[in-house]
């Protein structure tokens, strides 16, 4: 069997491999050692017994999308059946005091690989043996602690594979400089040690994307905006736009990034090198926001100008890279893949990212202020509680609801919240009466709201003991 027979549904073409050469990866036309690494089709009954106590699930994630030329990182995490975990030595053990369907286990080990590897023979003192090899026969790398790594991960994409020895979690990074743009498929097969051979325990696949557009996301924040995710904002208040560039491999770290904004309200173009910008819309309506991000990034060099034409045709100056079947190198001239040049690492290319949003601007409550507080006199005998009137003004649209949140002096522990509808005239002057239980200092958060906005003001007030001579004090506003 070949690797593509084991790892994929369909044999990838040489064309795919030639156009997507991954550094350090091998052609999936290579032979797979089926004696050491048995191959089970989906639905094979042997999968049921491939792991003690249930099935292992592999979760494959990536930091896709990747800007072409950057690195994309794939992570595989193994999820073991309930009550099982990997210990520091790489053995699989039962968690203490954890009960699964089989109850508590007397044996602490699910798989005690340490004991097995210490017993193993035929290693001629070097730790090298015919079974410490990957499916293509390459020996395991013998770095310190390699014996504690009991899982073999085979990654497969674009007609190529990469083998890795690891624990219950591994990461692999791939440079995308030679990868065709668009969605691609990564498949991973995981084997575990089993005596002097290996047993498949999980298979997983995931789509990743390589793009020549900088992946751009924009968050928008505006004070008093009731719902920041609905792309409806308020007139006459600044909106803060924050640009997030998805660049997990820091490919653009040394690039100068320019942000070109068009807010769609005839205020022209705004160019900045800062990833945040504030903009205030002064008219109601619907506006088309456009952002173009530009970065000079490492990239392919333009081809050299063609040499002057000789009088009779001669072979071109192009570099010829021979492309052979990995097992049977052919004679010179067999299936040449002509590349116009070897890419120069030092070239820069402008990369662009785009973001577009439609923003709706509406009237909203712009500001709220408490202009007066009055202690409402109560008839004797004095009750425990105090009634206080807050005289409130607002600017902008007319509120439909008022809420007061009364809390401790740190404004962290809420004592009570009261909301009520309000009917306010054009002047936006209203009185809010609230009850305070006992004397002391209180934090009062007062909000005025309508469908789209929510304006807040806060104050600390001191409610005195019920002595008529004690004035009500606004501690600070």
């Amino acid at each position: 069997k070949r690797f593509h027979d084991v790892l994929g549904n369909e044999r990838p073409s040489a064309y795919m491999r030639e156009h997507n050469q991954l550094n350090g990866w091998s052609s999936d036309e290579n032979d797979w050692n089926e004696k050491l690494y048995p191959v089970w089709k989906r639905g094979d009954m042997r999968w049921k017994n491939s792991w003690k106590g249930g099935r292992v699930q592999a979760v494959l994630t990536s930091d896709s999308p990747a800007l072409v030329g950057s690195n994309i990182t794939f992570a595989v995490n193994l999820i073991f059946p309930r009550c099982q975990k990997e210990d520091a030595n790489g053995n699989i053990v039962y968690e203490k005091n954890c009960r699964n369907e089989a109850g508590l286990s007397a044996d602490p080990y699910v798989y005690n690989w340490t004991a097995w590897s210490e017993d193993s023979d035929g290693e001629n003192g070097t730790g090298q043996s015919h079974h410490n090899v990957f499916p293509d026969g390459k020996p395991f790398p013998h770095h310190p602690g390699w014996r504690r790594w009991n899982f073999i991960y085979v990654f497969h994409t674009l007609g190529q594979y990469f083998q890795k020895l690891g624990r219950c979690s591994v990461r692999v990074s791939v440079n995308t400089a030679n990868v065709t743009l668009g969605p691609q498929l990564m498949e991973v097969t995981v084997y575990r040690r089993h005596g002097r051979a290996y047993v498949p325990i999980a298979q997983v696949k995931d789509v990743y994307v390589v793009t020549d557009q900088i992946p751009v996301f924009v968050t928008m924040f505006q004070k008093n905006d009731r719902n920041s995710s609905d792309e409806t904002f308020l007139k006459d208040l600044p909106i803060m736009f924050d640009v997030l560039i998805h660049d997990p491999s820091h490919f653009l770290n040394y690039s100068t990034i320019n942000y070109k904004w068009s807010f769609g309200d005839n205020t022209g173009l705004f160019v900045s090198t800062n990833h945040t910008v504030n903009h205030t819309y002064v008219l109601n309506g619907t506006f088309s926001l456009n952002l173009t991000v530009k970065a000079a990034a490492p990239g392919p060099c333009p081809p050299p100008p063609p040499p002057p034409r000789p009088s009779k045709p001669t072979p071109s100056l192009a570099t010829t890279l021979k492309s052979y079947d990995s097992n049977t190198p052919g004679p010179a001239g067999d299936n040449p893949l002509e590349l116009s040049r070897i890419p120069d690492e030092n070239c820069q290319i402008n990369r662009y990212g785009h973001f577009q949003a439609t923003i709706t601007i509406v009237e909203g409550i712009l500001e709220v202020n408490i202009i007066q507080m009055t202690d409402v006199l109560m008839p004797v005998p004095w009750p425990e509680s105090s009634l206080i009137d807050f005289v409130v003004t607002c600017q902008g649209s007319i509120p439909t609801e008022v809420c007061t949140i009364i809390s401790d002096p740190t404004c962290e522990i809420t004592q009570n919240t009261v909301c009520s509808p309000v009917d306010v005239d054009e002047m936006c002057l209203l009185t809010v009466r609230r009850t305070f239980n006992g004397s002391g200092t209180y934090c009062v958060n007062l909000t005025l709201g309508d469908d789209t906005s929510l304006a807040l003001t806060s104050t600390l007030i001191s409610v005195p003991d019920r002595d008529p001579a004690s004035p009500l004090r606004m501690a600070n506003s």
Epitope: S13, Y15, E18, L181, D212
Partner: antibody, heavy 119, light 107 residues
């Protein structure tokens, strides 16, 4: 929708060069390799080569090596194929065709450009 | 280079009858083989890719089969509009190659 529009017919003398253009629209131009295929009158299809608009890498069929040059103008999403030292047997319809991702089959073709080489 | 041998060169079939075209490659290209239909004055039109996958919008009377080095295009019930030249193409490796073509006519 994807469209490949080629330049008009050309008549050339032997020994001259011809440059055929293929303007792409309806997709991300830099994401797909563009190929050139020719067809002599009453004959079959013959693959000439391909170019990657993203980095301008080219692969040419051995038969055309040294005579063909494929180039790209990203600003206009146009691919060019120049064939030099023309001979009468280069009389053919020249097609541009777009590959699909990592697969070299062609769902999209230009309308073709007839190049006639005659003294 | 991979050599493509298409047979027969021409084929006359009655309307509603089955037409079968063969394509043989000099080395294993499986499953990277495509089939095209070309009518006079038009560019080729993709019918089948990866040996057996019908391209979007292609009538289901067209089917592709085969593996390794032997592939077949079948038109299960020939219609008048199927009169054309049919080409196979290997998309396994560069240089890409086309078969010599099969002309399908109505008997």
């Amino acid at each position: 929708q994807v469209q490949l529009v080629q330049s008009g017919a050309e008549v050339k003398k032997p020994g001259a060069s011809v440059k055929v253009s293929c303007k792409a629209s309806g997709y991300t131009f830099t994401s797909y390799w563009m190929h050139w295929v020719r067809q002599a009158p009453g004959q079959g299809l013959e693959w000439m080569g391909e170019i990657n608009p993203y980095d301008q890498r080219t692969n040419y069929a051995q038969k055309f090596q040294g005579r063909v040059t494929m180039t790209v103008d990203k600003s206009t999403s146009t691919v060019y194929m120049e064939l030099s030292s023309l001979r009468s047997e280069d009389t053919a319809v020249y097609y541009c065709a777009r590959s699909t991702g990592n697969y070299a089959w062609f769902a999209y073709w230009g309308q073709g450009t007839l190049v006639t080489v005659s003294s | 280079d991979i050599v493509m041998t298409q047979s027969p060169d021409s084929l006359a079939v009655s309307l509603g009858e089955r037409a079968t075209i063969n394509c043989k490659t000099s080395q294993d290209v499986s499953p990277s083989l495509a089939w095209y239909q070309q009518k006079p004055g038009q560019p080729p039109k993709l019918l089948i890719y990866s040996a057996s996958k019908r391209y979007t919008g292609v009538p289901d009377r067209f089917s592709g089969s085969g593996s390794g080095t032997d592939f077949t295009l079948t038109i299960s019930s020939l219609q008048a509009e199927d009169v054309a030249v049919y080409y196979c193409q290997q998309h396994y490796s560069i240089p890409l190659q086309f078969g010599g073509g099969t002309k399908v006519e109505i008997k």
